[in-house]
Amino acid sequence: GQGTPSLVPHEEAAAPGRTTATPAGASLEWSQARGLLFSPAPQPRRLLPGPQENSVQSSACGRQHLEPTGTIDMRGPGQADCAVAIGRPLGEVVTLRVLESSLNCSAGDMLLLWGRLTWRKMCRKLLDMTFSSKTNTLVVRQRCGRPGGGVLLRYGSQLAPETFYRECDMQLFGPWGEIVSPSLSPATSNAGGCRLFINVAPHARIAIHALATNMGAGTEGANASYILIRDTHSLRTTAFHGQQVLYWESESSQAEMEFSEGFLKAQASLRGQYWTLQSWVPEMQDPQSWKGKEGT
């Protein structure tokens, strides 16, 4: 095994305290060149320290990687449970290739892949295996009981062969940032609603605090005005109707907000922040921890 896991080409992809927002179809580089689409909010007081605040990380574990390509060495991280997150703009997919693997499948070692349309456990026949995510984000979690064991991964990204995103969908990465709902425009008028995806470091949870205004009276049918927030891991979904201050916490590091077509047509607005909380249990830490987490 390796004493010091490495990440190529950059040690830390997402700078602490920075949010990257990209609309569907926009490249990450394009959005950064223009500056942040959502200006960073004052950092809210956290209940617990965020996982991305350490200036030096000696392990690959716990990181969020936003580069187009990279190598992630999860061999010998010194912990049985190691997770990394990979994030790309909407409209791209993540490809993963296992360069080396010393997982002991019969001892319960495994690799877990997690995303909006991906819930995969794998161990056997990993070497040289190439996996392509269905969406732009992927959490890779390794469970390895043997010191020095683990996998060496190479990841890349490419344009999705087809996309299930709408023009008005947005993606947020990073440990905290500002949330602003989309407004009615040609891109949103026939979209059937717009979504905002939030992905943070893999051992973190997401807290959202926001004010919803001008929500309108429609609660049923095609013109219903509502906001849905869904935890990508547990699939727990919460609906918010009417003008209110909303607070929501995820169970995992991935969340999806949906603004209904009625919300957009009512010219409703949501403004607020999200930030990270320390996870009480690492998502997918143990396969048995998946028990009871399915269903909504």
Epitope: L117, K121, R124, F164, W290, K291, E294
Partner: antibody, heavy 122, light 107 residues
Framework: QVQLVQSGGGLVQPGRSLRLSCAAS????????MHWVRQAPGKGLEWVSG????????GYADSVKGRFTISRDNAKNSLYLQMNSLRAEDTALYYC???????????????WGQGTLVTVSS | ELQMTQSPSSLSASVGDRVTITCRAS??????LNWYQQKPGKAPKLLIY???SLQSGVPSRFSGSGSGTDFTLTISSLQPEDFATYYC?????????FGQGTKLEIK
Amino acid sequence: QVQLVQSGGGLVQPGRSLRLSCAASGFIFDDYAMHWVRQAPGKGLEWVSGISWNSGSIGYADSVKGRFTISRDNAKNSLYLQMNSLRAEDTALYYCAKDPNSLYRSGSFDYWGQGTLVTVSS
Amino acid sequence: ELQMTQSPSSLSASVGDRVTITCRASQSISSYLNWYQQKPGKAPKLLIYAASSLQSGVPSRFSGSGSGTDFTLTISSLQPEDFATYYCQQSYSTPYTFGQGTKLEIK
């Protein structure tokens, strides 16, 4: 290639039991969730039950909850559906189906067995 | 339980026609919608997952679109082997539910 071969269907009286089996090959069985879906004669499709790769999570349709039990034996690459207290309305063609993911909550079915007919009648 | 409603329930068309089948969910299901094709005496076959993603091996004349509550399956140019029954299915929450089916017949 992926194959799902089903067995265990037949004619049974109301109130009795039946066990369906599904033998899988052509893929790493214990990497994937599995489901049972049924189709009453001349009718549409109805999801019956799903089970995660390690049996850690299981779900049932309300219509069969408490009467049917889904299980799997990863060592034998097999999926089972134990059906107790059968009713006339359980009469259907039962399909086993593979999920493209490991957790049954993925909820899609990329490969299907050939189906096995269960007829509940006195 | 989420209700899925397909329309039309049956449809007559000719080879070469462009055909659209719609599916409506009783509440928003984001893009968690799948389409299946079933021929008489056969098991269903997955065509489209996640509303618009083409399953491997499925001809490109099949396409899916939509999100939220309204979805469509389009066959750009009908082939003789496409005459079958088509089902939509939501994978947003359990219990997973299917539409009642659309039977596509030769005119």
